[in-house]
Structures are given as C-alpha cells and as structure tokens.
C-alpha cells in the first residue's frame, strides 16, 4: 500500500510569547513546529514515529495564521507519506517550538524550547474530506485538519491496491474508486483484454483481436462468418460445413460438374424426339419416323422407308412420294398383281402359290431374301437398329452394331462408365468427368492416371492434422486434407465447437 | 510445470531468414492467461523485445524490427515460431522464448534456455 | 521511442542494501518488472507489478515505482545476488528494456 496523511496548519495562537516552562520568549516565541506519526496507542509514548515525521521552518512569531503553500520550503498542508497499508487508526503528536536560530533549518538550531505540544490518537478512514480540529491548553491554541489520501495509482479503503491505467495488449481499462478494472468501451476480461467482436459474429467461426471487428477461421466466410466456404472448383453445388460441396438436383461429380440431367438442362433432341438421360452428360434421342441422326436433327427422305413393292421405284415428291409400278404391277405401292404363277414372278428360287383361285399369287422366299417376289437380299440395317451413333453392318444371315466409344450393347444402347476400363493406376480413384476420366491418386502418385511415382510426396511430412486422411493430386497446392468429424480447416486443424473459455477457437 | 524450448539453425547467412521454434510443455499455449513473446540479447549486451503473439494469432512487434519480422503460433503443436528476414551480423543474438503472463502486467514468468544464433557467410 | 535508463554498474557489501535505479518518463504511471541474469542462465523475474514477488523469490527483493523512477532494493545482499538486473515496462504495446546493471557484492 502507499498513501499519504495531510496535516494542514491553520492558525497558531501564543499571545503572551511564554514557553512551556513559564518562561517568556525575547523578543517573541519565533514558532516553528514538530510532527510525529506513529501507530495507534492508548497512551502515547516516546519512541520512533513509525509512520513518519515531518519539521517546518519558522511559520510566525507568537499568534499568527498559516497559509497554504504548494511547493518549496514551509509547505503547508505537510505531507507525511507511507507505504504500507493505512490500518485505519494512528497517533499524532504536533510539537510547537521556538528556535532563536535559523528560521530555514530551525530543527538544527541548539537552544530550542518547547512551546507547547498536542497529542490526538484514534481512528481516521481513508478519503477527501478534511477532518478539523482545536486544541487548547492554558497558553496556546492551535487550529489544524488532516486526512488520509491514497498515492497515485492507490486504491481502496487502506491504499492496498495497486491499479494503473492501461491501453496495450495486456489490457484497456481504467481504475475504479476502489482499484477495480473498468474496461474501456469495446473490451471485456477480467483484465480488459479480451475484444467485444462485431455483434453477432459467429462465436466458434468467427474470432477479433480487436473491438467490432469479425475476423473469419479458416473455411468460413461472410459479415459474420456464419457462412461456410464449399469445396474448391465446386460447380453447382453448396455446403453446409466448410469444403463440402453438396450437390444441386441434378447434378453430380466431386466438384458437382457432371450435369445428371442433361436432357432438362439442355433439350438436344430435336423435331420432337423423346430425349433420356444416361449417366453424366450422357442422353439419347428416340426419333420419331422421318427423322435421324444423334439428335434426330436430320429428316429422312419420303421414299427412305422403300414404300414401294414388287420393284416399283420411288420418286420423291413434295411431302409425298410416287411409285412407278414395272410391268404387271399396280397401286399405290404397287401392291397389286397382274400377274399369275404361270409367269414365273418369283426371282432368287423363291416358291409360287396361287391365290384368289388362281387370280394372284404369293411367293415364299429363301433365306436372305425378301420382297413380293423375293427381289430383294435382306438388309438387316434398314430399321436402324444401332442407337447412339452405332454403325450397322451387315454379316451374311446377321447383323452387327458397330459402337463409338463410350457404348456398348448388341445396338450400342448401354453407356460405358469411363472408369470401366479402371485407367487409374496405384489404386487411384476414378471419377467420371465430360471430358474423360479423371483419377484421384493415391499418395505418393500424381499424372491423369496416377503413373507418375512422385519422389517428394506431399502429404509425407503429414500435413494434415487430427488423423485427417491426405489425397495429392486435386488441388492447386498438391494436396488435400479430408477431416474427421469435429474437424475444419484445409489442414484439418481447428476443433469445431470448444467450451466458451476458448473465445476464439473454432 | 511449464518449459519453453528453442530449436532452429545456430547459422544464418547475411541477407537469409533466420526461424526459430518455441515448444511448450507442461501446459496448453491455448491458455487465455498469457502472451508467448522472443527476446534476444547480442553477446556482451543487454535485452530487445522483438515481438510477441496471443494464441488467436494477434501480434505486436518491437517497431524497430516491424518490417523483418513475423512470429505464429501453431496450438495443435504448442509451438509459436519467430521469422527474421534479411539478417545481418547484428542480428547474432541469443534469442529467448519467454511466457508473458497477464496476471503480472505483462511479466515474462518463464523463459526458454536460450539459442544462440550466428549470422555469418 | 520510449526509453528505460540504468546506472550501468552497482557495488555493494555483502549484508548491506543495494539499490538500483531505472528512470523514465512518467515510468511511474506504468507497470515496472525487474529481471536477474547470471552469466550463462537465462533471466528470471524477481519483481512484477512494481513491488510484487513472484513465489520462490526471496523477500529481500522489494521494488517500488514513483514519479520517473523505479527502484529495485535488495536488502541484506548476499554474494548469490551478484547479476545483471534488467528494469522493462510496457510502452503501448511494445515491450522495453532498460540496458542492465551490473551488480557486484564486494568481498
């Protein structure tokens, strides 16, 4: 503790100039006085004055009145400071004396005669106020007040705390009354050393080192970082915890590029054909009749369907056709017969029976060949029966779909992953992207298809935290970290959610 | 009890970037209580506060060494790390990690045994 | 820039009080902390807050902070005491360090 007890002198009365002996001062009692604190105690002893004792230099001669003085020599109110703490009671012996030597430095003077002397014991509590007094014996009268001030930076009922007013890190605040802390505006601890963040900032998310400041952790983004930041690259998709990357409807993919549902996105069939989605970025387009081509973009001839029989031939016409019959044929089509079996119409050893009593006929045909009089060899590819693209190729009695690559099937109607083929070596991970496969390597392995032995691994010096699973290969910085639950941070390095004495952490 | 101990290379050549870590034991960098903060002391002089750093990551550094210098903190490890770049001869200091406690207006209550650093070619 | 200054060397008998000095502006509205260094050893803190002991410092280390100076006292000096001592307060948010004093016990 450190303080300081005041011990102002107001006025000194001696009108007859006598000594304490009776005796009487030439020319005048030159007055100076002698302070003594100490302790409390009953009955005053002589002893040391042991909480301090303070002289004056000659104040006036006989009766006169003291004035306040701040500075130099005869400073009044005299300042006896401590430091200790103020136990609440004290002894005070004021001493009046007459020096007939230096009036500066009277205490060093031989000769000194006692004038006279009070003694005050009891109890005082630290504060501003002055307490007065007056004190009178048969010759003298002496008028003072006094009080206890704590030092500066000293606080509390007996000076005992110590509090100095801070504006660093290692607090922001003002003392109280008391020696409390009181936080300046914007910080809050019990030193004042913890910032107030920006209101409504994300408690585990969000952190400050300043007042209504919001400053995100790593994965969080926003005001207040209460929003999370979704996978890298990641399309068309959202999270929920920082580097997720969800996908929309539709959509799928590591990084939600791979459109599921093209047919909606996209509409590529063409003049009205029925479009199905197969797989990312895969569809295919039912054609109605009259149209071909991937996406049934191209209309066919009206004579493509061969609507003409019995060898007639067909001549386009504007949104019609005409056939032209050969001999012994008629119709639209050139369905009727004028003919018989006894004119042999039946080519390529095809059988002749008689029909309508013998008015038409109908022949049976050999194998490979077709037609009313089994004019035509059989050509299996005329239906289209090869889907998405495949070429049709005909092979004696059969027929074969010649797939582009990415289908399969006997008319090349099922889609074949790209992963299929498993093109990723070491034991990469495949996913299928629009543009090929695209391999997720193992560590220690990078290349499109993982057959590049890396010799400095990036994730040897293990630079995921928490037992956070290391891949290489999917981003710019050559690794990626896959947190455990209850871990964010692309190293996998906070803990989500501590208790609240951690004000920050995340 | 708590340690503080300094690791990093006892050579930097002039112009390079002198690192040093400091590991804690004994106790959790993560404390709200304290400031983890490098001191150094050329051979023959007295000590400079070079920066120090909370465990949330705020910083403050000594002004004169402002623009060389960068101290972290990596909690998962319990270590916080010092950078000095562009040394030059009178950089050759032992440099001290030091806990810096609150509940003392600041005091470094605990110090690191020290690691003297040379800076020469 | 704020600065703490020490009288560079202090002799004092063993058994006797030593004092050491460290002044700067207004030092005594800022928290003062004293460090020992022995040759060798890293610093330890004797005194923080001015006048407080940290536990396991002898109470013959008392220190005191007023007006431009801060004092540490060391009563009944004892041969052990014989160190560098190392004045340091805080100036905003930067630490600061006075340049030392060698004490030596005579004897």
């Known amino acids: 503790g450190s303080g300081i007890f005041q011990l102002r002198l107001q006025e000194f009365v001696n009108q007859r100039g006598m000594l304490a002996n009776g005796q009487s001062c030439e020319p005048g009692c030159r007055t100076f006085f002698r302070i003594c604190l100490k302790h409390f105690q009953a009955t005053f002893s002589e002893g040391p004055c042991t909480f301090g004792n303070v002289s004056t230099p000659v104040l006036g001669t006989n009766s006169f009145v003291v004035r306040d003085k701040n500075s130099g020599s005869g400073r009044n109110p005299l300042q006896l400071p401590f430091n200790f703490t103020w136990p609440g009671t004290f002894s005070l012996n004021i001493q009046a004396w007459h020096t007939p030597g230096d009036d500066l430095r009277p205490e060093t003077s031989p000769g000194n005669s006692l004038i006279s002397q009070i003694i005050i014991q009891g109890s005082l509590a630290v504060g501003k106020i002055w307490r007065t007094d007056e004190q009178n014996d048969t010759l003298t009268r002496l008028s003072y007040s006094y009080r206890v001030i704590c030092s500066d930076n000293y606080y509390g009922e007996s000076c005992s705390r110590l509090c100095k007013k801070r504006d660093d890190h290692f607090g922001h605040y003002e003392c109280q009354p008391d020696g409390s802390l009181s936080c300046l505006p914007g910080w809050t601890g019990k030193y004042c050393d913890q910032p107030i963040c920006l209101s409504g900032c994300h408690e585990q998310n969000g952190y400050c080192s300043k007042p209504d400041e919001c400053i995100c952790r790593p994965g969080w983004q926003g005001r207040l970082c209460n929003e999370c930041i979704p996978h890298n690259g990641c399309r068309h998709g959202t999270c929920s915890i920082p580097w997720q990357c969800a996908c929309d409807e539709g959509w799928g993919g590591l990084f939600c590029d791979q459109d599921l549902n093209y047919c909606t996105h996209h509409s590529p069939c063409k003049n009205g054909s029925t479009c199905s989605n197969s797989g990312p970025k895969g569809y295919t387009c039912t054609c109605l009749p009259g149209y071909t081509g991937e996406h049934c973009e191209l209309g066919l001839s009206k004579c493509a369907s061969n609507p003409c029989r019995n060898g007639g031939s067909c001549k386009d016409q504007e949104n019609s056709y005409h056939c032209l019959c050969p001999p012994g044929y008629y119709g639209q089509h050139c369905e009727h017969s004028t003919l018989t079996c006894a004119d042999s119409p039946c080519f390529n050893g095809g059988s002749c029976r008689e029909r309508n009593q013998g008015s038409s006929y109908a022949c049976e045909c050999p194998p490979n060949f077709t037609g009313s009089n089994c004019e035509k060899k059989v050509d299996r590819c005329t239906s289209n029966p090869c889907a998405n693209g495949g070429q049709c190729q005909n092979r004696g009695p059969s027929r074969t779909c010649r797939c582009r690559p990415g289908f399969t099937g006997t008319h090349c109607e099922l889609h074949i992953s790209d992963c299929a083929r498993s093109p990723c070596a070491h034991g990469g991970t495949c996913h299928d992207l629009e543009n090929g496969p695209v391999c997720t390597c193992p560590a220690g392995f990078s290349g499109r298809r993982c057959e590049v032995r890396i010799t400095h691994d990036a994730c040897a010096s293990g630079p995921c935290f928490n037992g956070a699973t290391c891949y290489t290969g999917l981003s710019p910085n050559n690794f990626v970290c896959n947190c455990p639950y209850g871990f964010v941070g692309s190293r996998c390095e906070f803990p989500v959610g501590l208790p609240p004495s951690f004000p920050w952490v995340a | 009890e708590v340690q503080l101990q300094e690791s990093g290379p006892g050579l930097v050549k002039p112009s390079e970037t002198l690192s040093l870590t400091c590991t804690v034991s004994?106790?959790?960098?993560?404390?709200?209580?304290?400031?983890w903060g490098w001191i150094r002391q050329p051979p023959g002089k007295g000590l400079e506060w070079i920066g120090d750093i909370y465990y949330t990551g705020s910083t403050y550094y000594n002004p004169s060494l402002k623009s060389r210098v960068t101290i972290s903190v990596d909690t998962s490890k319990n270590q916080f790390s010092l950078k000095l770049s562009s040394v030059t001869a009178a950089d050759t200091a032992v440099y001290y990690c030091?806990?810096?406690?609150?509940?003392?207006?600041?005091?470094?209550?605990?110090w690191g045994q020290g690691t003297l650093v040379t800076v020469s070619s | 820039s704020y600065e703490l200054t020490q009288p560079p060397s202090v002799s004092v008998s063993p058994g006797q009080t030593a004092s050491i000095t460290c002044s700067g502006q207004r030092l005594g509205d800022k928290y003062a902390s004293w460090y020992q260094q022995k040759p060798g050893q890293s610093p330890v803190l004797v005194i923080y807050?001015?006048?407080k002991r940290p536990s396991g410092i002898p109470e013959r280390f008392s220190g005191s902070n007023s007006g431009d100076t801060a004092t540490l006292t060391i009563s009944g000096t004892q041969p052990m005491d014989e160190a560098d001592y190392y004045c340091q307060a805080w100036d905003r948010d930067t630490g600061v360090f006075g340049g030392g004093t060698k004490l030596t016990v005579l004897g």
């Open positions: 807050e001015d006048s």
């Open positions: 030091a806990r810096q406690a609150l509940a003392m207006g600041g005091g470094s209550d605990k």
């Open positions: 004994g106790g959790s960098i993560s404390s709200s209580s304290y400031y």
